[in-house]
Amino acid sequence: ESGYAQNGDLEDAELDDYSFSCYSQLEVNGSQHSLTCAFEDPDVNTTNLEFEICGALVEVKCLSFRKLQEIYFIETKKFLLIGKSNICVKVGGKSLTCKKIDLTTIVKPEAPFDLSVIYREGANDFVVTFNTSHLQKKYVKVLMHDVAYRQEKDENKWMHVNLSSTKLTLLQRNLQPEAMYEIKVRSIPDHYFKGFWSEWSPSYYFRTPEINNSPGEMDP
């Protein structure tokens, strides 16, 4: 490590050509963890380029990534999950650029699934529920969820609600009547683990009922 440039500008210049980013997924396949890396520049010629991770591993010094089209991938049980790993882009055994990364700070959860919305006529509300595989996991169990919904005709006017549970109630009075809504949800690690938003769940579509006022009844 002692051979690295100490000047900040030189340091970043060294990374420019082969800048890459990575995310980890813990217990993504049983007790196996995964690490996925890709170059920031999609035009990088990846022929002969390899990725390797060294340090903060169990029983081995280094592991090589598999290449799957334009991404580089490892699935293993051998992440120590404490301390920093050195992830390097290599060509012919020579390192072109490296990053020290703590795998617990680049966690990307799996996308939530089974999103559904049920209208409760008596309560005049919509109960939003969804599921996450992380309820069964032993490491990244605590997540923050971002539920986003919009009226289908308002292309970029998303409303967001952050919550830690997998159930949300939307009041009918806060939604437009007789409108089609799209809703989706994603997750990010909370409590110790850090990282990135998951992919969005598949969208769910629901229609709000018309306002049905009885004679003499006030608008809600």
């Epitope: 490590e1 002692s2 404490i82 703590d102 700070t105």
Partner: antibody
Framework: QVQLVQSGAEVKKPGASVKVSCKAS????????LHWVKQAPGQGLEWIGG????????AYNQKFKGKVTLTSDRSTSTVYMELSSLRSEDTAVYYC???????????WGQGTTVTVSS | DIVLTQSPASLAVSPGQRATITCRTS??????????MHWYQQKPGQPPKLLIY???NLESGVPARFSGSGSETDFTLTINPVEAEDTANYYC?????????FGGGTKVEIK
């Protein structure tokens, strides 16, 4: 080899400020967060806060917020801890320490003694 | 804040014997098999030195007579066999939750 070298001892009057430096060498400065730990005379260790030299992002022990400001200078691979409104209870040895992981400290500076006395 | 309680506060051990220090936390510092407990040695006039990280991982360059174990709220540092140069204060530290707190220390003396 990996080293953290801190500035020399300081004697300050109550109400004054002091800025302690910690110069890193032997590794790429932006690869590791640097933290500060207080040790009052005859006492144990107390985490003050840390800084990520790559981003300048800081984390502080709530107890030291308003008392301590952490900064870093990538051009000289140096981090700084400024203590303000000094009081006698700030008399201590202050250590900078590199975080080898979240958040344990694998390399320590030699310590800087700050004495607050009228 | 998570409180770390070390015991004993001090102990005297003969060379070649085993020294055991315990650290109990006010709440769990483990996430499954990830145990966020670390141990340091501090000799008079010197900065602390990392011995064990993640409850049981020996820091590079630290003699194998130092070992760590434990999970959740109960952790142990063992020195076996103790040598004269092990006279020092020993501290545990948790890193699951900010602020990252240390135990009060255990003073180990060699008889």
């Amino acid at each position: 080899q990996v080293q953290l070298v801190q500035s020399g001892a300081e004697v300050k009057k109550p109400g004054a400020s002091v800025k302690v430096s910690c110069k890193a060498s032997g590794y790429r400065f932006t690869d590791y967060e640097l933290h500060w730990v207080k040790q009052a005379p005859g006492q144990g260790l107390e985490w003050i806060g840390g800084i990520d030299p790559k981003t300048g992002g800081t984390a502080y022990n709530q107890k030291f917020k308003g008392k301590v400001t952490l900064t870093s200078d990538r051009s000289t691979s140096t981090v700084y801890m400024e203590l303000s409104s000094l009081r006698s209870e700030d008399t201590a040895v202050y250590y900078c320490a590199r975080s080898g992981g979240r958040w344990y400290f694998d390399v320590w500076g030699q310590g800087t003694t700050v004495t607050v006395s009228s | 804040d998570i409180v770390l309680t070390q015991s004993p506060a001090s102990l005297a051990v003969s060379p070649g014997q085993r020294a055991t220090i315990t650290c109990r936390t006010s709440e769990s510092v483990s996430i499954h098999l990830l145990h966020l407990m670390h141990w340091y040695q501090q000799k008079p006039g010197q900065p602390p030195k990392l011995l064990i990280y993640g409850a049981s991982n020996l820091e590079s360059g630290v003699p194998a007579r130092f070992s760590g174990s434990g999970s959740e709220t109960d952790f142990t540092l063992t020195i076996n066999p103790v040598e004269a140069e092990d006279t020092a204060n020993y501290y545990c530290q948790q890193s699951i939750k900010d602020p990252y707190t240390f135990g009060g220390g255990t003073k180990v003396e060699i008889k």
